[in-house]
Interface confidence: low
């Protein structure tokens, strides 16, 4: 029976050209987390296995860094980053449960409160 | 209006510590998450840790171990512990609201020297 959930940061906003951190946590289950997936429509971003680390699809690379935690940080965004992102943990015995996230570029202009930081 | 306040800031030899202090209002602080982020003069801001409602915590591997993020929900206030700092934890540190990190503070200088 799985009884765990997935919390989120749910629905964002960010500027273009900024960054931002995607983040999920998995609560209120024992399960063991075996990997989780980030992926962006159908595309995969990255994978953090438990034992073999973090693996960033080649395409994504230069714009895409691991973490914090289980987390994503996308960089230098663009408008056409904008969609639905979905973080899916992989585990032992529940299953898979599956976080979703609306992530909306806005140009810099629209964006008043956009993030501005960067991870080093 | 959302306002988030920072404090705690000072100068503190190499190896001390220091708590920082950020007051949110204007927004449901136990349902939203809260980040520390640090800018050192002439560098770009970078994050630092997070906090997510139920007291869930993320950090920068440069602090890990030695930074605690925390968070009193019925004092609407996040906290930095900062221990065992080092000169290169120099820097102008700002807490910002979560989600997107959409508001700012507008931060406390820590420096660290002897």
């Known amino acids: 029976m799985m009884t765990g959930t997935i919390e989120t940061t749910g629905n964002i906003s960010a500027e273009k050209g900024g960054s931002i951190i995607l983040q999920c946590h998995l609560s209120s289950t024992t399960a063991q987390v075996t990997q989780v997936n980030w992926e962006q429509q159908d595309q995969l971003l990255a994978i953090c296995n438990a034992d073999l680390g973090w693996h960033i699809s080649p395409s994504f690379k230069d714009r895409v860094a691991p973490g914090p935690g289980l987390g994503l940080t996308l960089q230098s965004l663009t408008v056409n980053d904008t969609g639905e992102y979905f973080c899916i943990y992989h585990t032992y015995p529940d299953g898979t449960y599956t976080g979703r996230i609306f992530l909306e570029v806005l140009e810099s202009s629209v964006a008043e409160h956009g993030a501005r930081f960067q991870i080093p | 209006e959302v306002q988030l306040v920072e404090s705690g800031g000072g100068l503190v030899q190499p190896g001390g510590s220091l708590r920082l202090s950020c007051a949110a209002s204007g927004f449901a602080f136990s349902s939203d998450w809260m980040g520390w982020f640090r800018q050192a003069p002439g560098k770009e801001r970078e994050w630092v840790a997070s906090v997510l409602r139920g007291g869930y915590t993320w950090y920068a591997d440069s602090v890990k171990g030695r930074f605690t993020i925390s968070a009193d929900n019925s004092k609407n206030t996040a906290y930095l512990q900062m221990n065992s700092l080092k000169p290169e934890d120099t820097a102008v540190y700002y807490c910002?609201?979560?989600?997107?990190?959409?508001?700012w503070g507008q931060g406390t200088l820590v420096t660290v020297s002897s």
């Open positions: 910002a609201r979560g989600e997107g990190f959409d508001y």
